[in-house]
Amino acid sequence: TPEVWVQVQMEATELSSFTVHCGFLGPGSISLVTVSWGGPDGAGGTKLAVLHPELGTRQWAPARQARWETQSSISLALEDSGASSPFANTTFCCKFASFPEGSWESCGSLPPSSDPGLSAPPTPVPILRAD
């Protein structure tokens, strides 16, 4: 069964900077990745970035840089301009559209006890929606 993993990392040097890493474990070819925060895409979440392997990427504030890391994983850098850090308690979700498997989504957040610079363990919370 395909699986999506999500890691949220706080940068040690800049506490207002976060990076979300997402990956797809399974067969098939990734055709689109959607990253959202506050919940799954289309279910209360706000879209942060869309990555298409053959057309490019699109991102929206506070996303700063979305990029492919491998053929099946991406990273999204976020910049928190506010004094407080809302990202620390936020859920980030990644949805991978894979042919012919369908869409697979998982969400994750920064653990409350995380030290800066340490990434959250890959604890997938699969939302199995084979669209």
């Epitope: 490019g56 840089q65 491998t70």
Partner: nanobody, 118 residues
Framework: EVQLVESGGGLVQPGGSLRLSCAAS????????MGWYRQAPGKDRELVAT???????KYVDSVKGRFTISRGDAKNSVYLQMNSLRAEDTAVYYC????????????WGQGTMVTVSS
Amino acid sequence: EVQLVESGGGLVQPGGSLRLSCAASETYFDLYVMGWYRQAPGKDRELVATITYTGSIKYVDSVKGRFTISRGDAKNSVYLQMNSLRAEDTAVYYCNADPSGLGRKVYWGQGTMVTVSS
């Protein structure tokens, strides 16, 4: 499908300058890597310069200090400012885009001719 349209080529004297432009037509997305390659008569196509949308730049040694690559604000256009042109810079210059940065799908423009001659 991404289409790349180049402009700015032409005939210039040695020591002169040209500015090449390349725009991706009707793309909703930002293209991660864009760049310029060139092919001189009877030679293989070679990298001239590339730039990622995060600003990482790479040049072939022979153009360092003479050519400058840059990107438009929309992240789907790229420019090549060519100064102190030499006869050996004569070639067809091709715009290139690698949307993912992984080489999964690479797009090419139709090419624009640059001739450096007195």
